[in-house]
Amino acid sequence: GPVPPSTALRELIEELVNITQNQKAPLCNGSMVWSINLTAGMYCAALESLINVSGCSAIEKTQRMLSGFCPHKVSAGQFSSLHVRDTKIEVAQFVKDLLLHLKKLFREGQFN
């Protein structure tokens, strides 16, 4: 059957932890991505931002997991109004910010 939302979120959090702790060289060669507003629709916005990073195996699983939280199909070059389009940050910082926010959502019971 389908994975419960709480389990899916916990697994996404654990995957982001694995990414941050296994960082030896700069994550995704220091690629920059658009910063996002960590609000409603955040999962799609995060996917839209990360999907523009190509050739980075370290975040491929994260991209797949985020797609499970986003109700619509996301493709490279697609951006929603949720992006703070004047700010780019390194993928590593993006992942750290996203991880902390998701841990707070988990605590608050916001699994979807």
Epitope: T20, Q21, F106, R107, E108, G109
Partner: antibody
């Protein structure tokens, strides 16, 4: 100002019971999860129990489960800990602690009482 | 149940930077809080949610949490920072709040 004041500590014989109370003031008690934390002399902090803001959920440390009961009265802004079948290893300072309530009570303890000493000795 | 491991003691000279670690399996997936306790006093929250600082706590205190280790960093250490420091997490699997064993910080 916001404060938590514990009472009810004292010296008690092994196997006997004791009831601790905590009076809260200066904040909206009914909107917070409440915990008991204890500290044996010269030892570290040990979490004892939690009760949800509305009293709907309680959880206990394995070391006290089945012997201690945490309750609250939101109309009187009080938290209680009923301690039965006390053992020498329950000797400690007991702190009443406040934590903002979420779906999961994973919040930090942002307000502590000064503690009340419980000594279990024959 | 979930176990948090801290070094029993850490020593530092005034004005230096010290780091107190808190180890736990995939602790990076949990929100970590840190407390300072001085002799005869109740603990005081110094860092919450991995890296946030209560308004009354000096900027010299900071926190991080990556992988299997959370870290409390105190910069420009003062004599008044001498205390016991405890890390804490909520263990979702057991519904228990868990404290580390505590680290005694001595300012030389």
């Amino acid at each position: 100002q916001m404060q938590l004041v514990e009472s009810g500590g004292g010296v008690v014989q092994p196997g006997r019971s004791l009831r601790l109370s905590c009076a809260a003031s200066g904040f909206e008690f009914r909107t917070y999860g409440m915990h008991w934390v204890r500290q044996a002399p010269g030892k570290g902090l040990e979490w004892v129990a939690v009760i949800w803001d509305d009293g709907s959920n309680t959880h206990y440390a394995d070391s006290v489960k089945g012997r201690f009961t945490i309750t609250r009265d939101n109309s009187k802004n009080t938290l209680n800990l009923q301690m039965n079948s006390l053992r020498a290893e329950d000797t400690a300072v007991y702190y009443c602690v406040r934590a903002p309530q979420w779906y999961l009570t994973a919040e930090a303890f942002d307000l502590w009482g000064q503690g009340t000493m419980v000594t279990v000795s024959s | 149940s979930y176990i948090l491991t801290q070094p029993p003691s850490v020593s530092v000279a005034p004005g230096e930077t010290t780091r107190i670690t808190c180890g736990g399996n995939l602790i990076g997936a949990k929100l970590v809080h840190w407390y300072q306790q001085k002799p005869g006093q109740a603990p005081v929250l110094v860092i919450y949610d991995d890296s946030d600082r209560p308004s009354r706590i000096p900027e010299r205190f900071s926190g991080s949490n990556i992988g299997n280790t959370a870290t409390l960093t105190i910069e420009d250490v003062e004599a008044g920072d001498e205390a016991d420091y405890y890390c804490q997490v909520w263990d979702y699997s057991s519904n228990h709040m868990v404290f580390g064993g505590g680290t005694k910080l001595t300012v030389l």
